[in-house]
Structure formats: structure tokens, C-alpha cells
């Protein structure tokens, strides 16, 4: 119901279609929604390794 045909991009691919400010891209249904509707991964403790890179989930500048 939510995975229509789409190209599979490489790891250096651009972000999905930009969302308006205050919206984030819901990777599970592939569309923009209010950021408050999504739950991000738990923050890493201070000093933890491998900080998460900026993702398509964050509001677009």
C-alpha cells in the first residue's frame, strides 16, 4: 500500500523530495508529515561514537 515503484539509490544519494519547514519525510510511508508525528531514534549519550548523519527525516532548510 505504500511502496510504489521507485528507484533504489546508492548510499550517497540525495535526500528525498524536500519537505516544507516544520515537516519531515516519513521514511516508512514515503511522504512529508509534521515532524511531531515521528519519533526519532533515542539520542546517543554524550561522547558516544558514530553520530548520526543528517537524514531526510529532518526539516529542510
Amino acid at each position: 500500500m505504500r511502496r510504489g515503484p521507485r528507484s533504489l539509490r546508492g548510499r550517497d544519494a540525495p535526500a528525498p523530495t524536500p519537505c516544507v519547514p516544520a515537516e519531515c519525510f516519513d521514511l516508512l510511508v514515503r511522504h512529508c508529515v509534521a515532524c511531531g508525528l515521528l519519533r526519532a531514534p533515542r539520542p546517543k549519550p554524550a561522547g558516544a561514537s558514530s553520530p548520526a548523519p543528517r537524514t531526510a527525516l529532518q526539516p529542510q532548510e
Epitope: 540525495p14 516508512l28 508525528l37 519519533r39 531514534p41
Partner: antibody
């Protein structure tokens, strides 16, 4: 911290309907995704489906004709209904919630269901 | 459905040594530059516990002895060094395409 707790019967007879409840504290079910997963004897895990922030549901096609997931936002609970159960539905049933990548970081303790006459 | 094949089915490792578990997907689980592959640990009587998400990101509170790697169709969970507390079944899971699916599990034991 999000906490989930399953409740429901431990024994159901074949052909009956299974109804389970997942009670959520620490977050609102009007945000995020709220899943049902089961683990069969023999350790196979199966994703059954979800209901999300908008009330949209997705059901595993292997169950589609028998499954329904609903919610009551006023109680912050969501529900699993599985019709026409057979002994093949004997499993431990978990509710869980994933973060943005679909990885499930909060789980209930699970409820064990036996389907037997 | 995307089929996830884990190997080995069971694994016995000496304390302090490295354990490596493989998960191969029947098709790519990458999209938007993200690998939608996750790893869980499950002990008897407990629900699965998230260890690694997005192929290589360590879940908060999980020891750095656990690491994940891979992209596309081939993924690896590494535990180094193995400790007694690591005895469990380990599962991979993909959330790239519906329905989300799990691997068959790898049982880790101490030699």
C-alpha cells in the same frame, strides 16, 4: 520512556477470534507507529502489521483476510483482532513501536497464546 | 516479500573472541541512501532488544562490543569480544519494503 503492555487471553479455541490489547504509557499513540509482532515456537518472528499516527493500518498479506488493528486514542491503547484462529497461531504476541527507520526500540514483554480445543 | 537468510544458524564462540553473524537479503534493502536493516538480541522469556539500526548505528545504551556493517543485500553483525551475557538468539530485520521481515535467527552459545 515508552512502555508497552500486552493483555488478553492465554488460551483460545480453534475458529474463535483472538483479541489483544496493547496499553501504552510514556508517549501518545497519535504519533509514531504501533506494531504487532509474534514469535512462533521454533523462534520464527513475524511482523503482523501496524497502525500509525494517522490511524492508517498496514497488514501483512499473509494475514490480511483475518487481521484487524484498531486504536482508542482516549485510552492510549491499540488492539489486535485475529479471526478464525488455528493451532498455527499459537505464539508469543508482542506489541512494539519503531522509530523513524522502522527499527523497534520499545517492546512489550509479550503474551503467550495457545490455540487448542 | 524480502527473504532474510541468516548464517550460521548456530554459533559457538569462546569468551573474549569475535562472533560474526551474516544476514543476506533476497533484494536490496537500501533506499534514500539508507540501509533499512536492523539487528536484535533476544534472550529466553524476554522481548527482542534493538542493538543496531540502519545497518551500522549503535542503539543507545548498547555496548560498543556490538557493531554492524554492510549495505544492499549483505550485512554483518559482529560481537567483539564475546561475553557470557551475549548468549541469545540474534535476528536481522528489514523495513525497506512491506511486509517487514525478520531473518530466521542465529543462536549464539559460549564454547
Amino acid at each position: 520512556e515508552v512502555q508497552l503492555q500486552e493483555s488478553g487471553p492465554s488460551l483460545v479455541k480453534p475458529s474463535q477470534t483472538l483479541s489483544l490489547t496493547c496499553s501504552v504509557t510514556g508517549d501518545s499513540i497519535t504519533r509514531g507507529y504501533w506494531n504487532w509482532i509474534r514469535k512462533f515456537p521454533g523462534n520464527k518472528l513475524e511482523f503482523m502489521g501496524y497502525i500509525n499516527y494517522s490511524g492508517t493500518t498496514y497488514y501483512n498479506p499473509s494475514l490480511k483476510s483475518r487481521i484487524s488493528i484498531t486504536r482508542d486514542t482516549s485510552k492510549n491503547q491499540y488492539y489486535l483482532q485475529l479471526n478464525s484462529v488455528t493451532t498455527e497461531d499459537t505464539a508469543t504476541y508482542y506489541c512494539a513501536t519503531p522509530h523513524t527507520y522502522g527499527a523497534m526500540d520499545y517492546w512489550g514483554q509479550g503474551t503467550t497464546l495457545t490455540v487448542s480445543a | 516479500d524480502i527473504v532474510l537468510t541468516q548464517s550460521p544458524v548456530s554459533l559457538a564462540v569462546s569468551l573474549g573472541q569475535r562472533a560474526t553473524i551474516s544476514c543476506r537479503a533476497s533484494e536490496s534493502v537500501d533506499d534514500y541512501g539508507i540501509s533499512f536493516m536492523h539487528w536484535y538480541q533476544q534472550k529466553p522469556g524476554q522481548p527482542p532488544k534493538l542493538l543496531i539500526y540502519r545497518a551500522s548505528d549503535l542503539e543507545s545504551g548498547i555496548p560498543a562490543r556490538f557493531s554492524g556493517s554492510g549495505s544492499g543485500t549483505d550485512f554483518t553483525l559482529t560481537i567483539n569480544p564475546v561475553e557470557t551475557d551475549d548468549v541469545a538468539i540474534y535476528y536481522c530485520q528489514q523495513t525497506s519494503k512491506d511486509p517487514w521481515t525478520f531473518g530466521g535467527g542465529t543462536k549464539l552459545e559460549i564454547k
